[in-house]
């Protein structure tokens, strides 16, 4: 039986040290390249094997990056976000939002007042 899918959203500060081949991940999103409907935020689309992010282990594909070295990523063009990462220096602090999928009980067994749909 299928359950209703909800999400648990948490935030984390991740400090990465730029490796020989960089930070080791890809991003999507921006005001000109929305990845999530009605959200121009910047999301991690790929973690490169053996890159700095993969070796650290905390950054995950699907994470939303809220800031880089304290600089907010809201309302940025995609390329401006890419350039911000590329110019972020050796020690890079990322504020990220993890979105964990949680199963919320089987459909058909909702409590009273629970929204249907």
């Amino acid at each position: 039986m299928n359950g209703r899918v909800d999400y648990l959203v948490t935030e984390e500060e991740i400090n990465l040290t730029r490796g020989p081949s960089g930070l080791g991940f890809n991003i999507v999103g921006g005001t000109d390249q929305q990845y999530v409907s009605n959200d121009s935020g910047i999301y991690v689309s790929r973690i490169k094997e053996n890159g700095a992010a993969a070796l650290d282990g905390r950054l995950q594909e699907g994470d939303k990056i809220l800031s880089v070295n304290g600089q907010d990523l809201k309302n940025l063009l995609h390329q401006d976000a890419v350039d911000l990462f590329r110019n972020a220096g050796y020690a890079v602090s990322l504020r990220v939002q993890h979105r964990l999928q949680v199963q919320n009980g089987p459909i058909g067994h909702r409590g009273e007042g629970d929204p249907s749909g």
């Epitope: 081949s21 960089g22 991940f25 991003i27 999507v28 000109d32 390249q33 689309s45 790929r46």
Partner: nanobody
């Protein structure tokens, strides 16, 4: 997942032109960065060209600069490689590759490990 299908390869005379196409399906095309690689007989796979999601940024191997042009049509989910002034040393199987998003690292376009999705290839023979 992303499916990539190349077409357009054939036998052509030296000095001639070809246009290769790579049709993508399975994911929003505008989020994919695309590359062309080639493998000549008995050689390693070699980077040829790269284009970013918008088409605003392109990158070429020195061996094809000025002769090859990569482009994309996001409405048709297709990337192209226009090959002019072909030489016998351009003979190879040409592969289309894709990765989701832009790398935040410089100089990663030419690394095949940076791509997750690959086509089956199309043969180009220059006589």
């Amino acid at each position: 997942d992303v499916q990539l299908v190349e077409s357009g390869g054939r036998l052509v005379q030296a000095g001639g032109s070809l246009r290769l196409s790579c049709a993508a399906s399975g994911r929003t095309f505008t989020h994919l960065n695309m590359g062309w690689f080639r493998r000549a007989p008995g050689k390693e796979r070699e980077f040829t060209a790269h284009i970013n999601w918008s088409g605003g940024s392109t990158n070429y191997a020195d061996s094809v600069k000025g002769r090859f042009t990569i482009s994309r049509d996001n409405a048709k989910n297709t990337v192209y490689l226009q090959m002019n002034s072909l030489k016998p040393e351009d003979t190879a199987v040409y592969y289309c590759a894709a990765t989701l998003g832009d790398s935040v690292d410089l100089d990663s376009d030419a690394d095949p490990r940076g791509y997750d999705y690959w086509g089956q290839g199309t043969q180009v023979t220059v006589s």
